[in-house]
């Protein structure tokens, strides 16, 4: 009994058969998040959990200085979750007195990073304006989409403010992708 | 025509070729939940339509008593949306006249439960804070993430409060995992 | 060594081994969208790219007029967010005097046409009540789930109100669905 | 070496307004959230307020919200505590200290404290 | 708001006791929670963040344990520096609260 024999008609023989068990596949876990140098105009990335309780790399999918890599090409389902949690931001009709302390918003980059590339690719953005009214506020963002990607490039997290990020649950924060 | 013959070279020969038709999944619906007994700190499991409608589980991925029930050890990915609905909650200054409408957060955990082990797990969060200004609310929480999960091993969704998830329709709030 | 030899007991024969990278796929995103004729009670549908930037099609999976087709049986994830944006949403005491710039709510519906079938089946949505204090709101909605699609399906994305869409960016909204 | 300095303590009557200062000096002080920290005479501590490293996000205690209020100068290694419409129960050594990335987290370096007295 | 409960509220200890303060939370805090020492006109000190992290710099019969709600910080062995009032906070959520206090005094 051969691969093709039930192969639909229209499948390419040029197409490789792979055993799903060895595609590359990460699930990273959010840790408390170290000083990092803020540029004007630029989202700091998030540094992850790669091996402990949720977090694992598998098959070549490696984890290292805040990035994902590629280790082969092909179409990547690719998913992260951040929580935001902060005080007090006034936003309403005393909003125009300027108070520095207001977040005008909450946003994730989910951002690829080809080497051959001068200028990183955003796959994914989340972006939310928060007006709290309330003295204690958190409510996460959610992504997720297929990608093409290439052997080698990067992936990274990015947000807008990492001092706003609830590292307090492995469940709460986290960045995966998987080969399809 | 032989299966090995154009795998790449990193595929390993112990990797089980499979036909991806054949493997578990299931897309679980909402229903009206009925009341339930829980206890302090403990949120509620929600239960679902497995057959009806949009629903449906396949390949051993078996539904009983709100927990999807894994039938074969590997990558999953599981999801799950749940939308709430509820009443003014006002919830500035005025909050600590401690109205009894008005919850401080929703949250959406989904959980596995492996029998030899005796806490659950919680394996994705989704959580946010509820200050409303208007008469009626309603929003959706959204979680999506992959994890290793054993056979055996049993997924549910819980709520911080049962009475205010939307069971009116069947696209609003669902519950799915499948085998990768 | 031949596909079968090392498959799982439970694995049947019948189930074609099918290669990967020959799956209908697709990452669909947004465009400014054009003024469209839209019925009393039914929401909009929003069109897309296909083809430029992030955005693809492969495999059969093809876009066409606002669809995308599904070119073979089977089940598909299928996912998007649309990111929402808009001025002022006054909605507390002074609610009742009818601002028209106040939409009560955002939704996304992912929707199947199916062509023997005389009703569209309402496959997700995602829908959010719309109560900002602040001048201007932003913020998306995420979908995804797992669905048995037949030959000549077709997928759409209907929103509430076409003209609150984010189409500024290809990473803010975006519609797609692969073969599982 | 980290350390943190308040000044503008005193003896201040009720209704009256205080501001308290804290210099920071010994590590990057734009890179950390901030706090103040109060001990009453005899009893526990109890946090007063926090502020982000960008004064992004802000909190108080509810014992001092609406009369208290928080800031900083990132170009001054300074912290600031704006403290109107006092009471007797302000009465307290009030602590500066230094927390970590996320304003919710715990202190890991404190000033000696300056001493606020509201007596009529 | 978490409330914290410290216990007890005085010990009294000789030098080489093992001493043991418990912590509990109103509702789960995970390991989200630190050690302070103050001694008599000084600023408190760090000795353990998340329930059981031994701060740089702090000896090392100072330890912590617990997560949840019932936690502990043990001195395996008092010494004459230990006798001071210790301090346990939350920082799970806002607003960041502290427990009453255990003085440590010489028996």
């Known amino acids: 009994l051969k691969g093709q024999e039930f192969a639909p008609s229209h499948q390419q023989v040029y197409a490789p058969l792979r055993a799903d068990g060895d595609k590359p596949r990460a699930h990273l876990t959010v840790v408390r998040q170290t000083p990092t140098q803020h540029f004007k105009n630029q989202f700091p990335a998030l540094h992850w959990e790669h091996e402990l309780g949720l977090a694992f790399t598998k098959n070549r999918m490696n984890y290292t200085n805040k990035f994902l890599l590629i280790p082969e090409s092909g179409d990547y389902f690719i998913y992260s979750q951040v929580t935001f949690r902060g005080m007090t931001s006034e936003c309403s009709e005393i909003r125009q007195a300027g108070r520095p302390n207001k977040p005008d918003s909450i946003t994730v980059v989910i951002t690829k990073v080809t080497d051959s590339y001068p200028e990183p690719t955003q796959l994914l953005m989340g972006t939310k304006s928060v007006c709290e009214v309330g003295s204690n506020w958190f409510q996460p963002i959610y992504l997720g989409a297929m990608f093409s990607l290439q052997e080698g490039d990067k992936l990274m997290v990015n947000v807008s403010d990492i001092s706003l990020v609830d590292y307090t649950k492995e469940d709460k924060t986290f960045f995966g992708a998987f080969l399809l | 025509l032989k299966g090995q013959e154009f795998a790449p070279s990193h595929q390993q020969v112990y990797a089980p070729l499979r036909a991806d038709g054949d493997k578990p999944r299931a897309h679980l619906t909402v229903v009206r939940q009925t009341p339930t007994q829980h206890f302090k700190n403990q949120f509620p499991a929600l239960h679902w339509e497995h057959e009806l409608g949009l629903a449906f589980t396949k390949n051993r991925m078996n539904y009983t008593n709100k927990f999807l029930l894994i039938p074969e050890s590997g990558d999953y990915f599981i999801y799950s949306q749940v939308t709430f609905r509820g009443m003014t909650s006002e919830c500035s200054e005025i909050r600590q006249a401690g109205r009894p409408n008005k919850p401080d957060s929703i949250t959406v955990v989904i959980t596995k439960v492996t029998d030899s082990y005796p806490e659950p797990t919680q394996l994705l969060m989704g959580t946010k804070s509820v200050c409303e200004v208007g008469s009626n609310w309603f929003q959706p929480i959204y979680l999506g993430a992959m994890f290793s999960l054993q056979e055996g091993d049993k997924l549910m969704v819980n709520v911080s409060d049962i009475s205010l998830v939307d069971y009116t329709k069947e696209d609003k709030t669902f519950f799915g995992a499948f085998l990768l | 060594l031949k596909g079968q030899e090392f498959a799982p007991s439970h694995q049947q024969v019948y189930a074609p081994l099918r290669a990967d990278g020959d799956k209908p796929r697709a990452h669909l995103t947004v465009v400014r969208q054009t003024p469209t004729q839209h019925f009393k009670n039914q929401f909009p549908a929003l069109h897309w790219e296909h083809e430029l930037g992030l955005a693809f099609t492969k495999n059969r999976m093809n876009y066409t007029n606002k669809f995308l087709l599904i070119p073979e049986s089977g089940d598909y994830f299928i996912y998007s967010q649309v990111t929402f944006r808009g001025m002022t949403s006054e909605c507390s005491e002074i609610r009742q005097a009818g601002r028209p710039n106040k939409p009560d709510s955002i939704t996304v519906v992912i929707t199947k046409v199916t062509d023997s079938y005389p009703e569209p089946t309402q496959l997700l949505m995602g829908t959010k009540s719309v109560c900002e204090v602040g001048s201007n709101w932003f913020q998306p909605i995420y979908l995804g789930a797992m669905f048995s699609l037949q030959e000549g399906d077709k997928l759409m994305v209907n929103v509430s109100d076409i003209s609150l869409v984010d189409y500024t960016k290809e990473d803010k909204t975006f519609f797609g669905a692969f073969l599982l | 070496e980290v350390q943190l300095v308040e000044s503008g303590g005193g003896l201040v009557q009720p209704g009256r307004s205080l501001r308290l200062s804290c210099a920071a000096s010994g590590f990057t002080f734009d890179d950390y959230a901030m706090h103040w920290v109060r001990q009453a005479p005899g009893k526990g501590l109890e946090w007063v307020s926090g502020?982000?490293?960008?004064?992004?996000?802000?909190g108080y205690a509810d014992s001092v919200k609406g009369r208290f209020t928080i800031s900083r100068d990132n170009a001054k290694n300074s912290l600031y505590l704006q403290m109107n419409s006092l009471r007797a129960e302000d009465t307290a050594v009030y602590y500066c200290?230094?927390?970590?990335?996320?304003?919710?987290?715990?202190?890991?370096?404190w000033g000696q404290g300056t001493l606020v007295t509201v007596s009529s | 708001d978490i409330q914290m409960t410290q216990s007890p509220s005085t010990l009294s200890a000789s030098v080489g006791d093992r001493v043991t303060i418990t912590c509990r939370a109103s509702q789960s805090i995970s390991s989200w929670l630190a050690w302070y020492q103050q001694k008599p006109g000084k600023a408190p000190k760090l000795l353990i963040y998340?329930?059981?992290s031994l701060e740089s710099g702090v000896p090392s019969r100072f330890s912590g344990s617990g997560s949840g709600t019932e936690f502990t910080l043990t001195i395996s062995s008092l010494q004459p520096d230990d006798f001071a009032t210790y301090y346990c906070e939350q920082y799970n959520s806002y607003p960041l609260t502290f427990g009453g206090g255990t003085k440590v005094e010489i028996k």
């Open positions: 998340d329930a059981s």
């Open positions: 502020i982000s490293w960008n004064s992004g996000s802000i």
């Open positions: 200290a230094k927390g970590q990335v996320a304003p919710l987290d715990h202190f890991d370096y």
